[in-house]
Structures are given as structure tokens and as C-alpha cells.
């Protein structure tokens, strides 16, 4: 089996639509199959077409984490078998976070993960660099909260209401929509207080580059960042 | 100053299509769902659906399905509310409201009386 | 669908107390909207999230939620609160915003 065309890397958005190609071409026609990670590719549409020995393989992906995607063509000469393999890469690009850049609307949630953490009734704000921000956001928590599974149980809850304040924001009331970050106060006694050990654990695997996972990019607020609370109560979240 | 200002009041046969605009001014019209509500002669208020300005997404009453089409205009920041096959019951008045950053509706149109008469 | 229920007129001397109640199964958990409606005007946002009240209304209204009612307290009534008061909630199941039957409130 040999592959003609190797499938591209890319650095996107989260929340975007990728598709990659590959096409191998031998005698028998190869099949190809797809690895997300070393394992087998858990989400995402495969298609492919078969002409003049050439197979062509799309591999279409929604992405909400950064991954090693790679291509096994394979074909078997009587006994023998022929294996060719290419991979490529699908990386984050750092987005501007909402509190940055506020485009975006205003509506209620209408989620489930954070259902039971969120006020009730709670008008957020969603945010438009995503193609459709009720289900990306909804994802990025949803894939951050499966993390959240490990941690300790007097961390869990404090950690929870991190999240889903973070990534479905208050929206403020008032001519522009406009997202209410998390006072800082709040942001800090989860770090520092019900989450000091998992989050120096996550800090340190962060540094190290041992752990680059999208909760941590995109998920976590940076404290020192947000509003606090004593310059005016009403420029941030309590949580 | 927010305001939402509608069209004027429109007289129809059975089986006639209404179309009632709501133009929006003072505040950032892709930023907030705008509802239609619209209350019948000596009756209460009834939610008929919204739509989304920033997506053009949209979710009707089920009693207004298949009848009911909302659509919005953003470079004219005008939603739209058009009800087909108009029977007398339909005469009422048709309200388009909004929340601005809560969850209750805290800006109305005026109202457009819409009367279904053969 | 959900339903939500207010008495249809309430009777009140100017000065006292009107209480206006609207049932709904497990309101407690929805926030609850008050509207203010006079003949031949736009309803009036008068109580939001089952307690606040929008910039420019009086102190005299106020609401609370609990268990299977709402209600809304207008305290020292005056002649010009004389209108119609709708509760509306949205129901998250459906994705449906709900109101109320609708209550008169007479200013005897």
C-alpha cells in the first residue's frame, strides 16, 4: 500500500469543522482506517470513494481538543501484509476568551451539564467567534466536567461552578450584550482553597507541557485576570 | 433611547397572510431574542415564539406551527412576524418584545391591532 | 404544557394590600415575571426573577416564589395600579415562555 496524499495539519478555532483527506492507492486497493491518539477514532464521520484503485478517505471532525490523527492504509498480498502511514496534527489557536472580546448574544441556557450550577432560568451570554456557541460552549464544558471526575470531592462542586460560570457568563443587563465575568475573590478560594492541590498538579503538568488538554486552555480562568469584587460589586459574577 | 417600533394596524379576509414588522432602536438588536405575544379583544397575553437576530434561529408556540414565520432583517434591525391563513380568531392585538439582559421581556412595541374580517 | 393559574379579578381599598397568587406545578424552581397591563397599553415589566424590580418601578411592588405559587404584593394601593397583572414564567422542558390567566385588580 502507498499513500499519495497524507492528510494536513491544522490550527483551529474550537468548536470548528475539520475534514481530513487521505488517498492511497496498491494492489489490492488498500483500506484505510483512522487513529485519533493511538486509539480508534471515537467521534467524527468517515466517507470515502474508490476509483481506478485509489481509495480517498474523509475523515470530518468537530474539534474541541488538540489530537495526533493519523492515516493506516493496508492491503494484504496473500500472506503479507502492506502497511503505509501519515498523520497530522489539529491544534488549538488561542481564542480571544469572552471577557475579551464581547461578541455575542444574550439568551437563556439551554444546556444540560450546567443546568443545576447556573442561577435559574439563567440568562447567558454566548459567544459568536463560535460557529454555533450554544453547542460549542455546551461541549467545552461537557468535555472539561468528564475531567472533573478525578478530582476530590470538596474540590468537585467549587470546581463545577468554576467551569460553567466561566464559559456560560451572566449576561448583563443593558443596551450591549456583555458578559459578566467571575469576581476574582470567587475565581481565587477555588484555586487556592477547595482545589489548592489539583490545580498546582494541573499548573504543573501546564509548565511542563506534559498536559495541554483544552480544559486547561480554555476552560480555567486566570484569576488574576478578573474583576474583583471590591471595585464594583456589579462588574462581576459571585459564584 | 430603546424603543420597538411596530407597524400599523392591518385589516385581512379569512385565509390572508398578515406580515407585521418591529424595528429596533437604542440598543444592539443581534444581541437579544425577540419574542411575538399577542393578545385577542377582552383576553390575556399569549406567547407565539422568538427568534434569534444574531442566527436567525427561531421556536414557535406549538399552536402556531406551520402557520407562524418569524424572519429579521439585521442591517435594518427589523424583526418580522408573518401569520398565514388568518381566521376571525386570529384578530388581536400583536405585540414584539424583548429582554435586555434578563430574563423577562422589559421592552414592548406599541401593538398592531390585525382584524380577520370577511 | 405547562399552565399557570391567577384568580380573575382581586379587590383592594386604596392604601391596603393587593396579593395577587399564580399557580403553577413546581414554580419554585422557574423564575416568575410580573406584567402590568392598562386598557389599550403595551404590558409593563413590574417584577422579574420573582423578586426584582426593573429601574423606575415603586418599592410597593414586590414578589416571591415558593413550592406551587408565586405572588405579587402590591403594598399601599394606589388608584393607578388599577390595571391587569400577568405572571409568566418560561418553561425549560418545552422551551415555551408561559402566561398567566390574568387578574383585574379593582382600586375600590
Known amino acids: 500500500a502507498r499513500i499519495l496524499r497524507a492528510p494536513e495539519s491544522h490550527n483551529v478555532t474550537f468548536g470548528s469543522f475539520v475534514t481530513l483527506h487521505c488517498t492511497a492507492t496498491g494492489i489490492p486497493v488498500p483500506t484505510i482506517t483512522w487513529i485519533e491518539n493511538g486509539n480508534a477514532v471515537s467521534s467524527g464521520s468517515i466517507q470515502e470513494s474508490v476509483k481506478d484503485r485509489v481509495i480517498d478517505s474523509r475523515l470530518q471532525l468537530f474539534i474541541t481538543k488538540p489530537g495526533l490523527y493519523t492515516c493506516i492504509a493496508t492491503n494484504k498480498h496473500g500472506e503479507k501484509f502492506s502497511t503505509a502511514k501519515a498523520a497530522a496534527t489539529i491544534s488549538i489557536a488561542e481564542w480571544s476568551k469572552p471577557q475579551k472580546d464581547n461578541k455575542g448574544y444574550c439568551a437563556q441556557y439551554r444546556g444540560e451539564v450546567c443546568n443545576a450550577v447556573l442561577a435559574k432560568d439563567a440568562l447567558v451570554f454566548l459567544n459568536t467567534s463560535y460557529a454555533d456557541p450554544e453547542e460549542a460552549q455546551e461541549l467545552l464544558v461537557h468535555t472539561a466536567w468528564n475531567e472533573l471526575k478525578v478530582v476530590s470531592p470538596v474540590c468537585r462542586p467549587a470546581a463545577e461552578a468554576l467551569l460553567c460560570n466561566h464559559i456560560f457568563q451572566e449576561c448583563s443587563p443593558g443596551v450591549v450584550p456583555t458578559p459578566i465575568p467571575i469576581c476574582r475573590e470567587y475565581c481565587l478560594a477555588v484555586k487556592e482553597l477547595f482545589c489548592a492541590k489539583e490545580w498546582l498538579v494541573m499548573e504543573e503538568k501546564t509548565h511542563r507541557g506534559l498536559y495541554r488538554s483544552e480544559m486547561h486552555l480554555l476552560s480555567v480562568p486566570e484569576c488574576s485576570k478578573l474583576p474583583s469584587m471590591h471595585w464594583d460589586p456589579t462588574a462581576c459574577a459571585r459564584l | 433611547q430603546v424603543h420597538l417600533v411596530q407597524s400599523g394596524a392591518e385589516v385581512k379576509k379569512p385565509g390572508a397572510s398578515v406580515k407585521v414588522s418591529c424595528k429596533a432602536s437604542?440598543?444592539?438588536?443581534?444581541?437579544?431574542?425577540m419574542h411575538w405575544v399577542r393578545q385577542a379583544p377582552g383576553q390575556g397575553l399569549e406567547w407565539m415564539g422568538w427568534?434569534?437576530?444574531?442566527?436567525?434561529?427561531?421556536s414557535y408556540a406549538q399552536k402556531f406551527q406551520g402557520r407562524v414565520t418569524m424572519t429579521r432583517d439585521t442591517s435594518i434591525s427589523t424583526a418580522y412576524m408573518e401569520l398565514s391563513r388568518l381566521i376571525s380568531d386570529d384578530t388581536a392585538v400583536y405585540y414584539c418584545?424583548?429582554?435586555?439582559?434578563?430574563?423577562?421581556?422589559?421592552?414592548w412595541g406599541q401593538g398592531t391591532m390585525v382584524t380577520v374580517s370577511s | 404544557s405547562y399552565v399557570l393559574t391567577q384568580p380573575p379579578s382581586v379587590s383592594v381599598a386604596p392604601g391596603q394590600t393587593a396579593r395577587i397568587t399564580c399557580g403553577g406545578n413546581?414554580?419554585?424552581?422557574?423564575?416568575v415575571h410580573w406584567y402590568q397591563q392598562k386598557p389599550g397599553q403595551a404590558p409593563v415589566l413590574v417584577v422579574y426573577?420573582?423578586?426584582d424590580r426593573p429601574s423606575g418601578i415603586p418599592e410597593r411592588f414586590s414578589g416571591s416564589n415558593s413550592g406551587n405559587t408565586a405572588t405579587l404584593t402590591i403594598s399601599r394601593v394606589e388608584a393607578g395600579d388599577e390595571a391587569d397583572y400577568y405572571c409568566?414564567?418560561?418553561?425549560?422542558?418545552?422551551?415555551?415562555?408561559?402566561f398567566g390567566t390574568g387578574t383585574k385588580v379593582t382600586v375600590l
Open positions: 413546581n414554580i419554585g424552581s422557574k423564575s
Open positions: 409568566q414564567v418560561w418553561d425549560r422542558s418545552s422551551d415555551h415562555y408561559v
Open positions: 437604542g440598543y444592539t438588536f443581534t444581541g437579544y431574542y
Open positions: 418584545a424583548s429582554g435586555l439582559g434578563i430574563s423577562a421581556f422589559d421592552i
Open positions: 426573577d420573582d423578586s
Open positions: 427568534i434569534n437576530p444574531y442566527s436567525g434561529g427561531t
